[in-house]
């Protein structure tokens, strides 16, 4: 029986150009975590495997950093990064647990002010 629960950072927002940490935590189970996959919609961002270490998808290598822990750091955020992110925990013997995070990337305040005001 699967007794565990995934706690996530839930809905988060960050500024364009900045960075954000995506974090999930599996609790209430003694199951062993064998692998955590990080996905954005249907795209694989990264894998953290207990035996093999990290795999970062080559198309995200310049903007994704492993950690902290089983989490993932997204850098140089763009508005296109807005959307759902999933942490998929493979555990033994329980099976698979999935957590969801919604990230909204906002235009930075500097950019907003730059659009509204002209420097004389």
């Amino acid at each position: 029986m699967m007794t565990g629960t995934i706690e996530t950072t839930g809905n988060i927002s960050a500024e364009k150009g900045g960075s954000i940490i995506l974090q999930c935590h599996l609790s209430s189970t003694t199951a062993q975590v064998t692998q955590v996959n990080w996905e954005q919609q249907d795209q694989l961002l990264a894998i953290c495997n207990a035996d093999l270490g990290w795999h970062i998808s080559p198309s995200f290598k310049d903007r994704v950093a492993p950690g902290p822990g089983l989490g993932l750091t997204l850098q140089s955020l763009t508005v296109n990064d807005t959307g759902e992110y999933f942490c998929i925990y493979h555990t033994y013997p329980d099976g698979t647990y999935t957590g969801r995070i919604f990230l909204e990337v906002l235009e930075s305040s500097v950019a907003e002010h730059g659009a509204r005001f002209q420097i004389p």
Epitope: Q35, I47, N49, L52, H55, S57, P58, H90, T96
Partner: antibody, heavy 119, light 107 residues
Framework: EVQLVQSGAEVKKPGASVKVSCKAS????????MHWVRQAPGQGLEWMGR????????KYNEKFKTRVTMTVDTSTSTVYMELSSLRSEDTAVYYC????????????WGQGTLVTVSS | DIQMTQSPSSLSASVGDRVTITCRAS??????LAWYQQKPGKAPKLLIY???TLAEGVPSRFSGSGSGTDFTLTISSLQPEDFATYYC?????????FGGGTKVEIK
Amino acid sequence: EVQLVQSGAEVKKPGASVKVSCKASGYTFTNYWMHWVRQAPGQGLEWMGRIDPDSTGSKYNEKFKTRVTMTVDTSTSTVYMELSSLRSEDTAVYYCAREGAYGYYFDYWGQGTLVTVSS
Amino acid sequence: DIQMTQSPSSLSASVGDRVTITCRASENIYSYLAWYQQKPGKAPKLLIYNARTLAEGVPSRFSGSGSGTDFTLTISSLQPEDFATYYCQYHSGSPLPFGGGTKVEIK
């Protein structure tokens, strides 16, 4: 076009070490981990370990942990695998293989390097 | 460690035949299975990863299926260039084990 070109065949005596090279081209070298896999004559495939050309971090098969060292030279896009304390059972073809984009499988392979251990 | 068992170890078939090779994992490996083709004196070539995703440039006559512990590689219509040895591999756990191989020979 992705290419992995390995060094030539080697003959070694028991107890010696061998260092095999694998030169990569046709892609961004630091974006993909590299693995080493060996195949004894007439036998199956055996994974030895992986190395990240970006951070030079590595992970080894427990079986080889005390005898294998994987290194990188980013200036020439080359990875190296050194195996020490050779014995006759290490006679095999050694392959470098690039890690795939979506996990720990191998999407491109070198042509292989035959290492013969014989007294 | 997880063990991968392929069957049969060899088979004889004719051009045009439908060929099925199976691979069994000793425990649940989800869909983390790859298939490779190897010809004598050559390096292996990736055919399929994640159990069913065809690698770039691989003909559509090759297909993969299965999840959990039981997996299948199917060649829908065997071609002369398909006579080779095929290996499965669990691609998400150390030591990234391969199956023992299945040699497809000409009948």
